[in-house]
């Protein structure tokens, strides 16, 4: 991981970028907490590993948050 | 396209204040972390600070920590750098420049680059 | 803190030649490795990140390459506009370090 930060919050930029989540290894929701006052949303990318972070407030971000819960609720039994 | 406009700038004594601006436009402000890196006259460049989207995280250079503040206001779309206690080695250009665009976590290399703001501290 | 160091510091060229300008790092950086361009009183210029990857509107003449400590810039075949200093800078950690430049002059 780069840039290893004393301060707790992982998000120096955020991008509203929509993601393909087919392209997405593994998507992290950080609540806030008493580090971070930030809800922060990393996505691990399947392609190097890369990891973005991703704006809540983007309508694309939301719809893609729905898509993937969507697709977990489906997997579950 | 993206720019960034440096100003603020002149010739201050030692021990005085000064603050530095950061216009941006062209791109999502809000959306960027953003930091200051200066040159001394004629020497390399030195990162200075960062602040990240909404203005929450801030981290300094040792050599400037507890004198530096760095500020940001989106509705302005404006960066700022408040400089305290000048030092004749403060005397550089300073730049502001962005984030990568693509803003992966854990970027600290820079996009793109204002055109600068001299400031010279001498008495 | 990381420590950069480049070279050579300048080194002299004539348009069309290859030129190789490297970067070692203090310690491991992964590829958290950036280049930029410095023309005289004008800002720096981004032209590589993740130590390979071209910014946008770079020419493909620019490459990098490297993981770890040790990193290069190659400019395939100079042109009279190349003529700059060059620095590398990792941001694997706080705070980003520089090089110390390199500075390429026409021969």
């Known amino acids: 991981i780069p840039l290893s930060r004393t301060v707790r919050c992982t998000c120096i930029s955020i991008s509203n970028q929509p993601v393909n989540p087919r392209s997405l290894e593994k998507l992290e929701i950080i609540p806030p907490s008493q580090f971070c006052p930030h809800v922060e949303i990393i996505a691990t990318m399947k392609k190097k590993g890369e990891k973005r972070c991703l704006n809540p407030e983007s309508k694309a971000i939301k719809n893609l948050l729905k898509a993937v819960s969507k697709e977990r609720s489906k997997r579950s039994p | 396209q993206v720019q960034l406009v440096e100003s603020g700038g002149g010739v201050v004594q030692p021990g005085r204040s000064l603050r530095l601006s950061c216009a941006a436009s062209?791109?999502?402000?809000?959306?960027?972390?953003m930091h200051w890196v200066r040159q001394a006259p004629g020497k390399g460049l030195e990162w200075v600070a960062v602040?990240?989207?909404?203005?929450?995280?801030?981290y300094y250079a040792d050599s400037v920590k507890g004198r530096f503040t760095i500020s940001r206001d989106n509705s302005k779309n404006t960066l700022y750098l408040q400089i305290n206690s000048l030092r004749a080695e403060d005397t550089a250009v300073y730049y502001c420049?962005?984030?990568?665009?693509?803003?992966?976590?854990?970027?600290?290399?820079?996009?793109?680059w204002g055109q600068g703001t001299l400031v010279t501290v001498s008495s | 803190d990381i420590q950069m160091t480049q070279s050579p510091s300048s080194l002299s060229a004539s348009v069309g030649d290859r030129v190789t300008i490297t970067c070692r790092a203090s310690?491991?950086?992964?590829?958290?490795l950036a280049w930029y361009q410095q023309k005289p009183e004008k800002a720096p210029k981004s032209l590589i990140y993740?130590?390979?990857s071209l910014q946008s509107g770079v020419p493909s003449r620019f490459s990098g390459s490297g993981s770890g400590t040790d990193f290069t810039l190659t400019i395939s075949s100079l042109q009279p506009e190349d003529f700059a200093t060059y620095y590398c800078?990792?941001?694997?950690?706080?705070?980003?370090?520089f090089g110390g430049g390199t500075k390429v002059e026409i021969k």
């Open positions: 420049a962005t984030e990568r665009g693509t803003h992966y976590y854990g970027s600290g290399s820079f996009d793109y």
């Open positions: 062209g791109f999502t402000f809000s959306n960027s972390g």
């Open positions: 602040i990240d989207y909404d203005g929450i995280i801030q």
């Open positions: 310690q491991g950086i992964s590829s958290w």
């Open positions: 993740a130590a390979s």
């Open positions: 800078q990792q941001y694997n950690s706080y705070p980003p370090t």
